[in-house]
């Protein structure tokens, strides 16, 4: 129950905190669980205990194992276990799952990526940051204290981010790296009754007989990702697919756009080779979501060809 997994790379510093906390004044004893051998507190040792911290400076693969810490409070000896695994350094760029810290999510307004475990170390700024093993460059990236700030976050910013810093212990420097995944999520959105931006209600659209015509139904539904939101066209109150006129088709798929942060959808109705009978039809742009349905009606009228000679 009071057990914690810790991991690191060989030849890097690794500092582990006892899973049992306590007042700073409490004595903490560390043992190597398999042998019950006490971990020394003298800093000249490569592996030594320092209060609630167990330090590997630097770590070796052979250090892997379970370590016991006992926090001696005035009333009880409280026991915790640190399960430490030290891995060999990978030659390629890929960071395996077992070396990854918890995934963090960011959005356009909040894009901080904290360097995991850094608070355990004696480090000085700046941190070095890498994404998918490439050093981050450019004004969009700012290393600030123990975190990375990304300006104008985009979905392409998702990926694995590695922070690299130097731990200093009594004048000796040790490298530390830590990697975590970053995902980009939409800002907290909201949903509202559909608002049709086009066409206007009872709009008259001029078309030329024999030519092609496009009608666009465009509506907004709120902010952020929307569920069960759709726009579509009807002819005389009938779905396009059921109307049975092959010249009149809805554009496959709905285009999602974000206008001023709003989530909007549009659907294009394409009429090929406009005929006289098309002018008699009622064209309904429908926008619907969980709040309800809004309908704007369009009619077609004949557009007189412009006489360029007059």
């Amino acid at each position: 129950k009071f057990s914690k997994q810790s991991w690191g790379l060989e030849n890097e510093a690794l500092i582990v905190r006892c899973p049992r906390q306590g007042k700073p004044s409490y004595t903490v004893d560390w043992y190597y669980s398999q042998t019950n051998k006490s971990i020394p507190t003298q800093e000249r040792n490569r592996v030594f205990a320092s209060g609630q911290l167990l330090k590997f400076l630097p770590a070796a693969v052979a250090d892997s194992g379970i370590y016991t810490c006992i926090v001696r409070s005035p009333t009880f000896n409280r026991t915790g276990y640190a399960n430490v695994t030290i891995y060999k350094k990978q030659s390629d760029c890929n960071v395996p799952d077992y070396l990854m810290y918890s995934t963090v999510s960011g959005s356009e307004k909040n894009s901080k990526i904290y360097c995991p475990t850094i608070d355990l170390y004696n480090w000085t700024a700046p941190l070095e940051w890498f994404k998918n093993c490439q050093a981050l460059q450019g004004s969009r990236y700012r290393a600030h204290k123990s975190f990375l700030v990304i300006d104008n976050v985009m979905t392409e910013d998702a990926g694995d981010y590695t922070c690299k810093f130097i731990h200093n212990e009594n004048g000796a420097n040790y490298s530390v790296t830590a990697t975590r995944s970053f995902t980009v999520k939409d800002e907290q959105g909201f949903s509202l009754f559909p608002v049709i931006g086009a066409p206007a209600q009872n709009e008259i659209k001029e078309v030329e007989i024999g030519k092609n015509a496009n009608l666009t139904c465009s509506a907004c539904f709120g902010k952020g990702t929307q569920f069960l939101a759709a726009v579509l066209w009807q002819l005389n109150g009938t779905k396009i697919t059921d109307f049975g006129e092959p010249r009149i088709q809805q554009e496959e798929g709905q285009n999602q756009s974000f206008s001023n942060g709003l989530a909007c959808l549009d659907m294009v109705l394409r009429i090929a080779d406009v005929k006289e009978e098309d002018l008699l039809l009622q064209y309904d742009c429908l926008a619907l979501n969980l709040h309800g349905l809004r309908r704007h009606t369009v009619r077609l009228s004949r557009k007189n060809p412009i006489d360029h000679h007059s």
Epitope: K23, S73, P74, F76
Partner: antibody, heavy 121, light 106 residues
């Protein structure tokens, strides 16, 4: 939310024993040590002892070492304190209590409502 | 064991008055906790780790001190503050409380 529900008032004969209970809810019983404190007119609050429900380990105020026995039943999330060889001086209110953050011993943040023990012939 | 001595044992204060009560430990302690108890009710954690206010405690309360000398202060007494206040150390076994300071409304 964390709640500690103590058993009702007890009237016992001098020299007899009594067992008080404290049922915990709203948290994982084995994650926090349970402490017992009493309130006396003369000394005010006095710490009696404590038990770690996970291990059964106990810690006592030496003054109460022969007087109190602490146990815990993990299955019912209940801590018990048996008081024996009762005298009139044991006629006080007994509380079970626990810290807010067990490991940091940051004061007794949660208290039972108290059990009044009356020792009388 | 560490003996905690609270003073005064009883005190009274008028509304708006500043109140200070002290707790002296027979040996040095690292932290002090304070509890408020009103008649017929369980104690309440009031100040912990010397100076941190427990949840719901008004900001007019404060705690300070180190070593063997600690105090609880109310910047402006209010009627609801009338109660008995106990200090407690958690630095050595046995855990010990002071005998309490009874604060009355004048």
């Amino acid at each position: 939310q964390v709640q500690l529900q103590q058993s009702g008032a007890e009237l016992v004969r001098p020299g007899a024993s009594v067992t008080l209970s404290c049922k915990a809810s709203g948290y994982t019983f084995t994650d926090s040590e349970m402490y017992w404190v009493r309130l006396t007119p003369v000394h005010g609050l006095e710490w009696i002892g404590a038990i770690d429900p996970e291990t059964g380990d106990t810690a006592f105020n030496q003054k109460f070492k022969g007087k109190a026995t602490l146990t815990a039943d993990k299955s019912s999330s209940t801590a018990y304190m048996e008081l024996r060889s009762l005298t009139s001086e044991d006629s006080v209110v007994y509380y079970c209590t626990r810290a807010f953050d067990n490991d940091n011993d940051d004061g007794f943040a949660y208290w039972g409502q108290g059990t009044l023990v009356t020792v009388s012939a | 064991q560490i003996v905690m001595t609270q003073s005064p044992a009883i005190m009274s204060a008028s509304p708006g008055e500043k109140v200070t009560m002290t707790c002296s430990a027979s040996s040095s302690v690292n932290y002090m906790h304070w509890y408020q108890q009103k008649s017929g009710t369980s104690p309440k954690r009031w100040i912990y780790d010397t100076s941190k206010l427990a949840s719901g405690v008004p900001a007019r309360f404060s705690g300070s001190g180190s070593g063997t000398s600690y105090s609880l202060t109310i910047s402006s007494m209010e009627a609801e503050d009338a109660a008995t206040y106990y200090c407690q150390q958690w630095s050595s076994n046995p855990l010990t409380f002071g005998a309490g300071t009874k604060l009355e409304l004048k």
